[in-house]
C-alpha cells in the first residue's frame, strides 16, 4: 500500500493529527523535499551573520558574513574576522606576515614566497608581505649581463578579495 | 615534462552530479595552485577556483561557490572539481590548470573535459 | 570583480600583417596581466605573463605591453599557424576575469 505522505511536496509536511493530509509548512520553517513528516526550522542569520538567501517554504536560509568578516565552514557555519594583505589572523589577533612570507588575501595564512628555482626559473619580480614573487624565465635563456629582479609592484587595496 | 590529464567527457541528467579528474605529473603537485576554467558552448574563459594541494586551501569565484566543490589527492597528484545540481546552463568544457610559479597566472593547461548536461 | 574588455571581438589579417589586440582593466591591475592562445582544437597556451614577459619557447613575433588598465597585444608578423582565439586575464585580485576573446582569422 502506497504511504499516503509520499504524495505531499515539498513545502508541505504529512501531518499525522489531520488524516495525514498535506499541510503547508509553518512561518519560519521549511521542507525541501516530498514526503516529509515535519517541516524544519529556519536558519537565522544573526549578530555577525547577515542574510544571503531569505527561507522559503522550500528552502533553508543561507547566511554570509558583515563586512569585516568572512565565511568558514560549510555552508558558512562560521565567521572570521578579516585580516590587511600581509597579515594573518593568530590567537593574538592579525599579525604581520614574517620575512619571506605574504598574504595577498583578507583571509587566510602567510605563506612561503615561491621558490622560483624549484621550476629551474629565476625571480623575475621579489615578494613583498601583500605578494608572491613572479618567477621568470630559467637563468639560462636570460642575455648575458641582464638583471632579471624587478622591484615588487607597490601593494594596493582591494588586492585579492575575500571569497 | 609538466602535464595535466584531465578525465573523459560526461553526460548526465539535470539534477544530477559530476566529478572532473586532473592528474598532474613532471612537476611537485604539493607547490603549485591549481586553477578550474569553464568555458561554455561559444562563450569566454570563466575562472571557477583555485586550490593549493599542500593543505587544500581553496579560492571560490562567487558564482560557483554553490556549484563547485574543488579538493585535492596528494597521494595520487590529482585534483578534481565537483559540480552538483546539474543544469543545461553548466554544460562546458571545464579546464584544469596549473600556475607558472606564482598564482597570478595559469601557465599548464589540461585538454578540457566536456561535461553536457542534457534531460 | 575586475572586468576586462577586449577588442576587437574578431579580426581578420593577412599574413605578414601587425596585429594589435587591446584589452581594458576596470580598475589598476598593476601588471598582473597574461595574454592566452586557444586554438580551433581547443587547446590552451599561456604566451605572456605579466605583461610584457613571453615564455619561453614563445616566438619573438608575440610581444605584450602596458600597466595599470590599458594593454596591448601584438603580433608582429601574422603566421598563417597563428589562427586561433586570444584571451587577455587578470591574475591581480580574485576572482581571476578574463576578456571576452578575440578571433583571429586570416584572409
Known amino acids: 500500500l502506497q504511504d499516503p505522505c509520499s504524495n505531499c511536496p515539498a513545502g508541505t509536511f504529512c501531518d499525522n493529527n489531520r488524516n495525514q493530509i498535506c499541510s503547508p509548512c509553518p512561518p519560519n520553517s521549511f521542507s525541501s523535499a516530498g514526503g516529509q513528516r515535519t517541516c524544519d526550522i529556519c536558519r537565522q542569520c544573526k549578530g555577525v551573520f547577515r542574510t544571503r538567501k531569505e527561507c522559503s517554504s522550500t528552502s533553508n536560509a543561507e547566511c554570509d558574513c558583515t563586512p569585516g568578516f568572512h565565511c568558514l565552514g560549510a555552508g558558512c557555519s562560521m565567521c572570521e574576522q578579516d585580516c590587511k594583505q600581509g597579515q594573518e589572523l593568530t590567537k593574538k589577533g592579525c599579525k604581520d606576515c614574517c620575512f619571506g612570507t605574504f598574504n595577498d588575501q583578507k583571509r587566510g595564512i602567510c605563506r612561503p614566497w615561491t621558490n622560483c628555482s624549484l621550476d629551474g626559473k629565476s625571480v623575475l619580480v621579489n615578494g613583498t608581505k601583500e605578494r608572491d614573487v613572479v618567477c621568470g624565465p630559467s637563468p639560462a635563456d636570460l642575455s648575458p649581463g641582464a638583471s632579471s629582479v624587478t622591484p615588487p609592484a607597490p601593494a594596493r587595496e582591494p588586492g585579492h578579495s575575500p571569497q | 615534462q609538466v602535464q595535466l590529464v584531465q578525465s573523459g567527457a560526461e553526460v548526465k541528467k539535470p539534477g544530477a552530479s559530476v566529478k572532473v579528474s586532473c592528474k598532474a605529473s613532471?612537476?611537485?603537485?604539493?607547490?603549485?595552485?591549481i586553477n578550474w576554467v569553464r568555458q561554455a558552448p561559444g562563450q569566454g574563459l570563466e575562472w571557477a577556483g583555485n586550490?593549493?594541494?599542500?593543505?587544500?586551501?581553496?579560492n571560490y569565484n562567487q558564482k560557483f561557490k554553490d556549484k563547485a566543490t574543488i579538493t585535492a589527492d596528494k597521494s595520487t597528484s590529482t585534483a578534481y572539481m565537483e559540480l552538483s545540481s546539474l543544469r543545461s546552463e553548466d554544460t562546458a568544457v571545464y579546464y584544469c590548470?596549473?600556475?607558472?610559479?606564482?598564482?597570478?597566472?595559469?601557465?599548464?593547461w589540461g585538454q578540457g573535459t566536456t561535461v553536457t548536461v542534457s534531460s | 570583480d575586475i572586468q576586462m574588455t577586449q577588442s576587437p571581438s574578431s579580426l581578420s589579417a593577412s599574413v605578414g600583417d601587425r596585429v594589435t589586440i587591446t584589452c581594458q582593466a576596470s580598475?589598476?591591475?598593476?601588471?598582473?596581466l597574461n595574454w592566452y592562445q586557444q586554438k580551433p582544437d581547443k587547446t590552451v597556451k599561456l604566451l605572456i605573463y605579466?605583461?610584457?614577459r613571453a615564455r619561453s619557447g614563445v616566438p619573438s613575433r608575440f610581444s605584450g605591453s602596458g600597466s595599470g588598465t590599458d594593454f596591448t597585444f601584438t603580433i608582429s608578423s601574422l603566421q598563417p599557424e597563428d589562427i586561433a582565439t586570444y584571451f587577455c586575464?587578470?591574475?591581480?585580485?580574485?576572482?581571476?576575469?578574463f576578456g571576452q576573446g578575440t578571433k583571429l582569422e586570416i584572409k
Open positions: 590548470t596549473r600556475d607558472y610559479g606564482s598564482a597570478y597566472s595559469m601557465s599548464t
Open positions: 613532471g612537476y611537485t603537485f604539493t607547490s603549485y595552485w
Open positions: 586550490i593549493y594541494p599542500s593543505d587544500s586551501y581553496t
Open positions: 586575464q587578470q591574475g591581480d585580485t580574485l576572482p581571476y576575469t
Open positions: 580598475q589598476d591591475i598593476s601588471n598582473y
Open positions: 605579466y605583461t610584457t
